[in-house]
Interface confidence: medium
C-alpha cells in the first residue's frame, strides 16, 4: 500500500540504486517515486552534514523486503516512494528555494523582475529543467535580477550550494503549465535524427511517448515496430534530444514511428503509467514472483499491489494453468521496461499500474516519527 | 479572500466552484474535491437551495470568467447535510456532495488529503485559504481564484474574540491579530489547507466570521478532523470501499 510517513533524524542503510542532489526531501521523494526501482529514500539537508559533497544528497534505495535498517543521523530525512499512492503521484514541484543555488549547465541568462517571472521563463523554455535567480540584494551588482535557465544530464542539479540572495526552483512543465504547447501527432514511417539520450523496449509508440514525456532529457522519440527489418532493433524506443529542441532532420523509414514529448502540453499530461494489456505478447525480465490467478486483469492487479513489480506476463499455456487459474509472472528490470518483447505467445502482458494517479488506493496521512 | 493574491493553474487542484443556475448563473460557494465522486463543502451553502438540479460544480478551473455554456460541469447526485446542522447555529457546518459522474484526476483536478480522525497533535504552521469570494466586506466575487496564507489561532484565543458564540472543539480558527487577511463572502465551503511534511491536508471548511479580515476577529472553520467518522460513513459505497481520500 501507500506509505507516506517521513522519518526524521533517520537514514536508510544500504540498498542504493541512484544518488543525486535535490533541494529538499519532498523533491527527493518525487524522484524516488518516478525511479523504476526506488522504494525508499534518504535525504541529507545542508544542516545535517559537514561533508560538502554530500550536502543536499538524495539517495534512492531498493530492497527485496521493501524495508532497510534505519540508522540515526541528526537532520537526515528518510521515507518511502509514493508508488501506489494514487493522486499524490505527480512530477510537479512548485516550491522556490531561498538562499540556494542549484548548479547545472547555464544556457540562458536574462534580467527579470521577480523569481516567479524567472520560473515562468524556465517553464516556457523547452530545454530548461531548473533555474536560479539572483535577487536585487545579491552581493554582486552586475548579477542582480539575473535569471539563469539550466539543465543537466539527469534533470537534477549537478550541485546545490547555499548562497545568500539567490532563489532556485524547477520548471513547471510537469505541472502542465507550459505555454509552449505540444505536438500530439504521431508520425508513421518517419525516423528522427539527433542525439539518443536513452534506449528502452516498449510494445508500442504510445508507451514510448509516455516514457519520453517523463524522461528529464527526452524531447522527441523514434520507435521501431515489431516488424522492423533488423530483428535486434524491434520494439526499440529511442529517446532523443537536440540543441534546438526539435529534430534537425527526419527520414522516411518504413516500420518506424516518431513523435514528441508531451511535457510541454498545456492543461493535460499523460499519466505516468501504461494501462493497456497486450495479447499474444511476452514481456521478459527478472522474475519477482509467480502466482496462480484467474484472468489477466487479476494478474495486472497483483502486479500493481506488489510494489516492486514493474510488468507482468499472464500465461495461457495448458501446462501453466490449473482449472480456472493460470500463471501470472511478476517481473522487473533495471529501467522499468521489459528486457525483451516476444510475440505470438499464448498469453498477455502489461505494466503495473502503481504510478497511475487515478487510483483510490492512496492514503493521505503523514506520521512523523522522531527517533 | 481579503488580502490575497492570484493563484496559478493547478496550485489548488481540489478547489471547486459551486454555482447556481436559476434565471442567471452565479458562484455561491467553494468546495473541496475529496474523491472521484465526492466534494466536501459547508452545509450553509444549501440554505434555501437544497434542490440538486439547480447546482453546477466546476472543477479544474482558475478563472470564473473563462466559464462559458460549453464548459463542462458536474451535477449533483446527492446532497448530504450533517444531521445536526441548524441554520440558526454555527455548529456542524459541513456537507457532502455526491457527483452524478466520477471525475478523472489531472494536475488541475485532484483531491485533497483528509486529516486523521481527531487530529489534535499536528502543529500546522503553513496554512492557506482559497476562494473566489469577496476581496473586501462590501465587495464582489473575484474572477481569478485567490489564495491567502493565514495562521491558525487557538480555540481559546478564538473564543475570547467571539464572546457571544460558542467556539467548539469541532471548529478551528485562523486569522491575524491585526486583521487584513481572511476569507469572505463567497468563500464559504472552500478549503483551509495546511502543508505538513510536504503534504497538503484539508484542515478546515470556510464557515463564518464577523465581517471579513477585521482586527481580532478570526475566521471560523469547520474542523474536518472532527468529522472523519461522519465523512467515512457517508462516503462508504455499497461494496464497502471508501470512495474518497481516506486517512490511514
Amino acid at each position: 500500500g501507500c506509505l507516506t510517513q517521513l522519518y526524521e533524524n533517520a537514514f536508510f542503510r544500504g540498498g542504493d540504486v541512484a544518488s543525486m542532489y535535490t533541494p529538499n526531501a519532498q523533491y527527493c521523494q518525487m524522484r524516488c517515486t518516478f525511479h523504476p526501482r526506488c522504494l525508499l529514500f534518504s535525504f541529507l539537508p545542508a544542516s545535517s552534514i559537514n561533508d560538502m559533497e554530500k550536502r543536499f544528497g538524495c539517495f534512492l534505495k531498493d530492497s527485496v523486503t521493501g524495508t532497510l535498517p534505519k540508522v540515526h543521523r541528526t537532520g537526515a530525512v528518510s521515507g518511502h516512494s509514493l508508488k501506489q499512492c494514487g493522486h499524490q503521484i505527480s512530477a510537479c514541484h512548485r516550491d522556490i528555494y531561498k538562499g540556494v543555488d542549484m548548479r547545472g549547465v547555464n544556457f540562458n541568462v536574462s534580467k527579470v523582475s521577480s523569481v516567479e517571472e524567472c520560473q515562468k521563463r524556465c517553464t516556457s523554455n523547452i530545454r530548461c529543467q531548473f533555474f536560479s535567480y539572483a535577487t536585487q540584494t545579491f552581493h554582486k551588482a552586475e548579477y542582480r535580477n539575473n535569471c539563469l535557465l539550466k539543465y543537466s544530464p539527469g534533470g537534477t542539479p549537478t550541485a546545490i550550494k547555499v548562497l545568500s540572495n539567490v532563489e532556485s526552483g524547477f520548471s513547471l512543465k510537469p505541472c502542465a503549465l507550459s505555454e509552449i504547447g505540444c505536438h500530439m501527432n504521431i508520425f508513421q514511417h518517419l525516423a528522427f535524427s539527433d542525439v539518443d539520450v536513452a534506449r528502452v523496449l516498449t510494445p508500442d509508440a504510445f508507451v514510448c511517448r509516455t516514457i519520453c514525456t517523463y524522461h528529464p532529457n527526452c524531447l522527441f522519440f523514434t520507435f521501431y515496430t515489431n516488424v522492423w527489418k533488423i530483428e535486434s532493433q524491434r520494439n526499440v524506443c529511442l529517446l532523443k534530444t537536440s540543441e534546438s529542441g526539435t529534430p534537425s532532420s527526419s527520414t522516411p523509414q518504413e516500420n518506424t514511428i516518431s513523435g514528441y514529448s508531451l511535457l510541454t502540453c498545456k492543461r493535460t499530461l499523460p499519466e505516468p503509467c501504461h494501462s493497456k494489456i497486450y495479447p499474444g505478447v511476452d514481456f521478459g525480465g527478472e522474475e519477482l514472483n509467480v502466482t496462480f490467478v484467474k484472468g489477466v486483469n487479476v494478474c495486472q492487479e497483483t502486479c500493481t499491489k506488489m510494489i516492486r513489480c514493474q510488468f507482468f506476463t499472464y500465461s495461457l499455456l495448458p501446462e501453466d494453468c490449473k482449472e480456472e487459474k493460470c500463471k501470472c509472472f511478476l517481473r522487473l528490470s533495471m529501467d522499468g521496461s521489459p528486457t525483451r518483447i516476444a510475440y505470438g505467445t499464448q498469453g498477455s502482458s502489461g505494466y503495473s499500474l502503481r504510478l497511475c494517479n487515478t487510483g483510490d488506493n492512496s492514503v493521505c496521512t503523514t506520521k512523523t516519527s522522531t527517533r | 479572500i481579503v488580502g490575497g493574491t492570484n493563484s496559478s493553474w493547478g496550485e489548488w487542484p481540489w478547489q471547486v466552484s459551486l454555482q447556481v443556475k436559476l434565471t442567471a448563473q452565479r458562484h455561491l460557494c467553494g468546495g473541496s474535491l475529496i474523491g472521484h465522486q465526492w466534494v466536501l463543502t459547508a452545509a450553509h451553502c444549501f440554505d434555501g437551495l437544497p434542490l440538486q438540479d439547480v447546482w453546477r460544480i466546476y472543477s479544474g478551473i482558475l478563472n470564473l470568467s473563462d466559464i462559458t455554456k460549453d464548459t463542462p460541469f458536474s451535477q449533483i447526485k446527492e446532497i448530504i447535510i450533517h444531521q445536526n446542522y441548524k441554520v440558526s447555529e454555527g455548529n456542524h457546518d459541513i456537507a457532502l456532495i455526491k457527483l452524478q459522474a466520477p471525475l478523472n484526476y489531472t494536475e488541475f483536478q485532484k483531491p485533497i488529503c483528509l486529516p486523521s480522525k481527531g487530529d489534535t497533535s499536528t502543529i500546522y504552521t503553513n496554512c492557506w485559504v482559497t476562494g473566489w469570494g469577496f476581496s473586501k466586506e462590501k465587495g464582489e466575487i473575484q474572477n481569478i481564484l485567490q489564495k491567502v496564507n493565514i495562521p491558525l489561532v487557538t480555540n481559546e484565543e478564538c473564543q475570547k474574540r467571539y464572546q457571544d458564540y460558542k467556539i467548539t472543539q469541532r471548529m478551528v480558527c485562523a486569522g491575524y491579530k491585526e486583521g487584513g487577511k481572511d476569507a469572505c463572502k463567497g468563500d464559504s465551503g472552500g478549503p483551509l489547507v495546511c502543508k505538513h511534511n510536504g503534504m497538503w491536508r484539508l484542515v478546515g471548511i470556510t464557515s463564518w466570521g464577523e465581517g471579513c479580515a477585521r482586527r481580532e476577529q478570526p475566521g471560523v472553520y469547520t474542523k474536518v478532523a472532527e468529522y472523519m467518522d461522519w465523512i467515512l460513513e457517508k462516503t462508504q459505497s455499497s461494496d464497502g470501499k471508501a470512495q474518497m481520500q481516506s486517512p490511514a
Epitope: - | 451553502c45 440554505d47 441548524k86 441554520v87 458564540y165 476569507a183 464557515s207 463564518w208 471579513c212
Partner: antibody, heavy 122, light 106 residues
Framework: EVQLLESGGGLVQPGGSLRLSCAAS????????MMWVRQAPGKGLEWVSG????????VYADSVKGRFTISRDNSKNTLYLQMNSLRAEDTAVYYC???????????????WGQGTMVTVSS | DIQMTQSPSTLSASVGDRVTITCRAS??????LAWYQQKPGKAPNLLIY???TLESGVPSRFSGSGSGTEFTLTISSLQPDDFATYYC????????FGQGTKVEIK
C-alpha cells in the same frame, strides 16, 4: 442570496380582509423565526407578529391580537399574514423579515423584503 | 412587554459632526439590541446587532455600545449619505422598535 418578496397588499374598506404573502429564498426557511413589521406613512417601525420555525408558536403585538393571523408553509417557503377586521390605523407598508440568529455566515445577507402597501379607507 | 425609548426624536447636524443616539429599554435585554438605518421609501438596513457588532459592509464610522438597558449608536463623522432615520430594536423577548431618530441637515 437571501430574498424576501411580499405581495397581496392593496386598497380595502374598513372591516374588510386581506391576505399578505412573503416568498422566501436563499436560506432554509423552515429553520427560522419569521415576522411581520409595518410602518404607517410618516411613522416609525412597529413589530406586528412573529412565528417560530415549526409554526407551532405564534406571537402578536397587542394592537393586532385577535384580528391578524400569521402562518407559514415550509414546503412552499412562504409566510402569510391573514388580516381581518381591518381599521384605518392598519394602513401601512408591511414588511416581512426574519429573526437573524446564529453565527455571521460567510455568505450574503439581507433580512428585509421591500414591503407591500396596505391602505384601509372607505 | 418591553418598551424601547429612543432619544432625541430629531437631531440636526452637519457633515463631519460626531452624532450620538441613545436607546433605553424598559427592562434588561442583555446585548440583544440592533440598530437600523432607513431612508424614505426603502426597507430598513441593519447597521449593528448584538449591541456593538458592526454588520458586514457597514462603514466603520458607525459604532454601538451598551448592555442591559442603556444603549448608544455613534456616528463618528457624519457623511452626506448618513442623513436618515435610525431605529433601535430589541430581540430579547419578541421584538420591539424604538420610535426612531431622524438625523437631518442643520
Amino acid at each position: 442570496e437571501v430574498q424576501l418578496l411580499e405581495s397581496g397588499g392593496g386598497l380595502v374598506q374598513p372591516g374588510g380582509s386581506l391576505r399578505l404573502s412573503c416568498a422566501a429564498s436563499g436560506f432554509t426557511f423552515s429553520h427560522y423565526i419569521m415576522m411581520w413589521v409595518r410602518q404607517a406613512p410618516g411613522k416609525g417601525l412597529e413589530w406586528v407578529s412573529g412565528i417560530y420555525s415549526s409554526g407551532g408558536i405564534t406571537v402578536y403585538a397587542d394592537s393586532v391580537k385577535g384580528r391578524f393571523t400569521i402562518s407559514r408553509d415550509n414546503s412552499k417557503n412562504t409566510l402569510y399574514l391573514q388580516m381581518n377586521s381591518l381599521r384605518a390605523e392598519d394602513t401601512a407598508v408591511y414588511y416581512c423579515a426574519y429573526q437573524r440568529t446564529g453565527v455571521p455566515r460567510r455568505d450574503s445577507f439581507n433580512i428585509w423584503g421591500q414591503g407591500t402597501m396596505v391602505t384601509v379607507s372607505s | 412587554d418591553i418598551q424601547m425609548t429612543q432619544s432625541p426624536s430629531t437631531l440636526s447636524a452637519s457633515v463631519g459632526d460626531r452624532v450620538t443616539i441613545t436607546c433605553r429599554a424598559s427592562q434588561s435585554i442583555s446585548s440583544w439590541l440592533a440598530w437600523y438605518q432607513q431612508k424614505p421609501g426603502k426597507a430598513p438596513n441593519l447597521l449593528i446587532y448584538k449591541a456593538s457588532t458592526l454588520e458586514s459592509g457597514v462603514p466603520s464610522r458607525f459604532s454601538g455600545s451598551g448592555s442591559g438597558t442603556e444603549f448608544t449608536l455613534t456616528i463618528s463623522s457624519l457623511q452626506p449619505d448618513d442623513f436618515a432615520t435610525y431605529y433601535c430594536q430589541q430581540y430579547n423577548t419578541y421584538w420591539t422598535f424604538g420610535q426612531g431618530t431622524k438625523v437631518e441637515i442643520k
